[in-house]
């Protein structure tokens, strides 16, 4: 009778993560008597996957009844495959012996490759907000996929971006891989409603790519434009001055009125109006009692937006033409939009 050969008919097997891998192995003879063992890898560091003779291998089941002497099918199934299971598996026949069984013949090996889906891409933007015309960086990360081949694209509002750099790690062989990409985006004043999208395509996704998004509303700061105007006189000796704060984002804004450099009133933007582009407008007014002033008045609208250094706009109020009331202590009547009069 010919000497036993161990046949592993499949050079490679490709399995999706979470599924069951079948590793086939047959012997050409029932002689010699002795157990079959399965190993991952070769050489002294090989990992025991299944031992016919003894041990507990909860993820492994045999295809046929290995307890029987007449069995020559030593195929196994490994359940709940993960990328960590990738490698070359060897079916090895041992000859019964003491104190240890003696390795007799090995199969040629079957390479198990695991297809694992990438994790949902996570897009993150800069830690601090930036203003229009500035270039900001967005990163996209996805992990745990196999095989290594993967495609990543960036979009801004549906338009594909070209200024990005992508790395897949590790460079060499691995059970699974990660992708990291950094895209550069130039902000515009209209980007409050904009989205940056990272799209990942992989063989495991069957043509349905994964997407991660970032809203530029988290990244952009649109500084306000200020306009201070003097309204027609509401009553004799009173002038209404308004400060129009336009096109700002985010909403966090504090406005201070100064009369000749002295703080008259401070208020926080509350009842704002939203523009189509997502920016906000707000208006504050100041009722100035001109009879309280002997000289011209310099009115300043000072705005601190989103924790940034204050910006201001001034308006010179000419009072020389007006008769002056003596003995008045009240310099101005301060009124914000939709606010009651304050004395």
């Amino acid at each position: 009778e010919e000497e036993l050969q161990v046949i592993q008919p499949d050079k490679s097997v490709l399995v999706a993560a979470g599924e069951t891998a079948t590793l086939r192995c047959t012997a050409t003879s029932l002689i010699p008597v002795g157990p079959i063992q399965w190993f991952r890898g070769a050489g002294p560091g090989r990992e025991l996957i299944y031992n016919q003779k003894e041990g507990h291998f909860p993820r492994v089941t045999t295809v046929s009844d290995l307890t029987k002497r007449n069995n020559m099918d030593f195929s196994i199934r490994i359940g709940n495959i993960t990328p960590a299971d990738a490698g070359t598996y060897y079916c090895v026949k041992f000859r019964k012996g003491s104190p240890d069984d003696v390795e007799f013949k090995s199969g040629a090996g079957t390479e198990l490759s695991v297809r694992a889906k990438p994790s949902a891409p996570v897009v993150s933007g800069p830690a601090a907000r930036a203003t229009p015309q500035h270039t900001v960086s967005f990163t996209c990360e996805s992990h745990g996929f196999s095989p290594r081949d993967i495609t990543l694209k960036w979009f801004k509002n549906g338009n594909e971006l070209s200024d990005f750099q992508t790395n897949v790690d590790p460079v060499g062989e691995s059970v699974s891989y990660s992708i990291h990409s950094t895209a550069k985006v130039v902000l515009t004043r209209e980007d409050v409603h904009s989205q940056v999208i990272c799209e990942v395509a992989h063989v495991t996704l069957q043509g349905d790519p994964l997407r991660g998004t970032a809203n530029l509303s988290e990244t952009i700061r649109v500084p306000p434009t200020l306009e201070v105007t003097q309204q027609p006189v509401r009553a004799e000796n009173q002038v209404n001055v308004t400060c129009q704060v336009r096109k700002f984002y985010p909403q966090r804004l504090q406005l201070t009125w100064l009369e000749n450099g002295n703080v008259s009133r401070t208020e926080t933007a509350s009842t704002v109006t939203e523009n189509k582009d997502g920016t906000y407008n707000w208006m504050s007014w100041l009722l100035v009692n001109v009879s309280a002033h002997r000289d011209d008045v310099k009115l300043t609208c000072q705005v601190e937006h989103d924790g940034q250094p204050a910006v201001s706009k001034s308006h010179d109020l000419k009072v020389s033409a007006h008769p002056k009331e003596q003995g008045s202590n009240t310099a101005a009547e301060n009124t914000g939009s939709n606010e009651r009069n304050i004395y």
Epitope: L30, V33, R69, N71, G97, S98, P99, D100
Partner: antibody
């Protein structure tokens, strides 16, 4: 049903010969190692011989050169040719199948009695 | 040849008892050890192979353990049908050899 049935035992004079048979049924006979085991009355078990799947044979020193094991796969039959019999060969002879992957015995016949006496 | 020594040679026990029979090999036999049960006038019955693997149809009250040279058979809760003679056997190499047997009797 897996079954082994021995036959051919009996009374034989010292120096005589006897041929035991074991008829196998219910399994693929050619795929198993087959053994003979004996037991003298009131004594323990003693392994007598084996014939492997490929026809290779082994014996203990006590019967080597006197006993010959053989098999006829086409007839699902195992044999033990016993020559130069001695009183010490008196025993019940069992055939057993090395049915487990490691050749452990899993199935035994009911036995046949061999008596060597003048 | 490898000698197999069983102890005790005989053992008295009661129904419901847990009993252990030991078997010692004269040299390392890996774990190629089997246990058999034999009742008077009957052929031996295979119980355990490869030290601890139960033959098909054998109840789980029988268990085996050990390695190298020292092995045990345990019957967890004796029933009337368990009173018999028990043999160990090494089958790592020819000639296969048996222990002398342990007779388990009702107390």
């Amino acid at each position: 049903e897996v079954q082994l049935v021995e036959s051919g035992g009996g009374l034989v004079q010292p120096g005589g010969s006897l041929r035991l048979s074991c008829a196998a049924s219910g399994f693929t006979f050619s795929s198993y190692d087959m053994h003979w085991v004996r037991q003298a009355t009131g004594k323990g078990l003693e392994w007598v011989s084996v014939i492997g799947i490929s026809g290779d044979t082994y014996y203990p020193g006590s019967v080597k050169g006197r006993f010959t094991i053989s098999r006829e796969n086409a007839k699902n039959s195992l044999y033990l040719q016993m020559n130069s019999l001695r009183a010490g060969d008196t025993a019940v002879y069992y055939c057993a199948r090395g049915g487990n992957w490691d050749d452990a015995f899993d199935i035994w016949g009911q036995g046949t009695m061999v008596t060597v006496s003048s | 040849d490898i000698q197999m020594t069983q102890s005790p040679s005989s053992l008295s026990a009661s129904v419901g008892d847990r009993v252990t029979i030991t078997c010692r090999a004269s040299q390392d036999i890996n774990n190629y050890l089997a246990w058999f049960q034999q009742k008077p006038g009957k052929a031996p019955k295979s119980l355990i192979y490869t030290t601890s693997s139960l033959q098909s149809g054998v109840p789980s009250k029988f268990s085996g353990s050990g390695s190298g040279t020292d092995f045990t058979l345990t019957i967890s809760s004796l029933q009337p049908e368990d009173f018999a003679t028990y043999y160990c056997q090494q089958y790592v190499s020819y000639p296969y050899t048996f222990g002398q047997g342990t007779k388990l009797e009702i107390k």
